[in-house]
Interface confidence: low
């Protein structure tokens, strides 16, 4: 069967890293520099992805596999295969149309990417606030007020008003 298939389609014999060159009587030619074929039987080689600008090379291109990119320090990947790089922000910030902005009061972000998320509402679980939240950290919920031993006290969270200078995102 293999013999029959190769008689019907000589290109099926061309391995990954080569292409079936119609200009040379379907000889298997090596992929030229900066191109690759990841499977056999290919009639062309694909151009290697180039990691330029804010992208940097995580894995070099080879004759059989494409280059893989990640982002330079200060940026992180977005999209399948790191198709985009997005600016990092500090913890306690989120990226907006106008750049990095501090999280509004009552929200936090403990990463350099993503959006600010609301503090956990401890009272929904019948618990009290043990440690106040910050821009960088969520609140820590403690035992329910009824479970507190004499002398222990929970932190009363401040009213969820916005801090001066922090507009809604």
């Amino acid at each position: 069967f293999e013999r029959t298939r190769s008689l019907q389609d000589p290109c099926s014999n061309c391995p990954a890293g080569t292409f079936c060159d119609n200009n040379r009587n379907q000889i298997c030619s090596p992929c030229p520099p900066n191109s690759f074929s990841s499977a056999g039987g290919q009639r062309t080689c694909d151009i290697c992805r180039q990691c330029k600008g804010v992208f940097r090379t995580r894995k070099e291109c080879s004759s059989t596999s494409n280059a893989e990119c990640d982002c330079t320090p200060g940026f992180h990947c977005l999209g399948a295969g790191c198709s985009m790089c997005e600016q990092d922000c500090k913890q306690g910030q989120e990226l907006t149309k106008k750049g990095c902005k501090d999280c509004c009061f009552g929200t936090f972000n403990d990463q350099k990417r993503g959006i600010c998320r609301p503090w956990t509402n401890c009272s929904l679980d019948g618990k009290s606030v043990l440690v106040n939240g910050t821009k960088e950290r969520d609140v820590v919920c403690g035992p329910s007020p009824a479970d507190l031993s004499p002398g222990a006290s929970s932190v009363t969270p401040p009213a969820p008003a916005r801090e001066p200078g922090h507009s809604p995102q």
Partner: antibody
């Protein structure tokens, strides 16, 4: 190479799809950018579609256009054309880089005329 | 969104002369700037990217420079074939999940 097609005379509000057909390179590793040029005016960037199908549009173009692709073509749909959308529409191969895209292979353009 | 202000809107110079085109961004664009040439009835042609990198096959008479918000395209030893409209194009960050690019208004170059 890249080649645009689908440009024609349409009445306002009639959806129109333009097609960019590529050859000699793979859309798996390149982005495709759409730019338009109203008669006698400058270039206007519309949007880009990346290797993984992710899209980005100019602020003015959001909601007015959609983009999709398969292995050899990229489609730009003008959802509800107005007379202001009369222009030559170009597609171009771009570096697959969200922060420094430049377009180094352009089609000849396809003319869209929107008129009642 | 970023605004790219290109000056002058048109310029005239003699063969062999030098032309300078400026492009000012409304904010720092970190050299993410390209220059294109467009002749009548033709698509744009990439000349320079990343502010100063010459595209393959483009004559060294074309020079890009600048940083921050101010960028310049200089065409020296002007030839009649350089008569065209020139556009700058820059990156901008449009939103958390999207990016975009914007063109300057264009500069027409007339060669006498």
């Amino acid at each position: 190479s890249v080649e645009e097609s689908g440009g024609r005379l349409v009445t306002p509000g009639t959806p129109l799809t333009l097609t960019c057909t590529v050859s000699g390179f793979s859309l798996t590793y390149y982005a495709v950018t759409w730019v338009r040029q109203p008669p006698g005016k400058g270039l206007e960037w519309i949007g880009v579609i990346y290797d993984n199908g992710a899209t980005a549009f100019a602020t003015w173009a959001k909601g007015r256009f959609t983009m999709s692709k398969n292995s050899t073509t990229v489609a730009l749909k003008v959802t509800s054309p107005t007379t202001e959308d009369t222009a030559t529409y170009f597609c171009a191969r771009s570096a697959n880089n969200a922060w420094s895209t430049y377009s180094n292979l352009w089609g000849q353009g396809t003319l869209v005329t929107v008129s009642s | 969104d970023i605004v790219m202000t290109q000056t002058p809107s048109s310029v005239s110079a003699a063969v062999g002369g030098t032309v300078t085109i400026n492009c000012q961004a409304s904010e720092d664009i970190s050299s993410y700037l390209s220059w294109y040439q467009q002749k009548l009835g033709q698509p744009p042609k990439l000349l320079i990217y990343k502010a100063s990198t010459l595209e393959s096959g483009v004559p060294s008479r074309f020079k890009g420079s600048g940083s921050g918000t101010e960028y310049t395209l200089t065409i020296s030893d002007l030839e009649s074939d350089d008569a065209a409209t020139y556009y700058c194009q820059s990156y901008y960050s449009g939103s958390i999940s999207g990016y975009g690019f914007v063109f300057g208004g264009g500069t027409g170059v007339v060669v006498k």
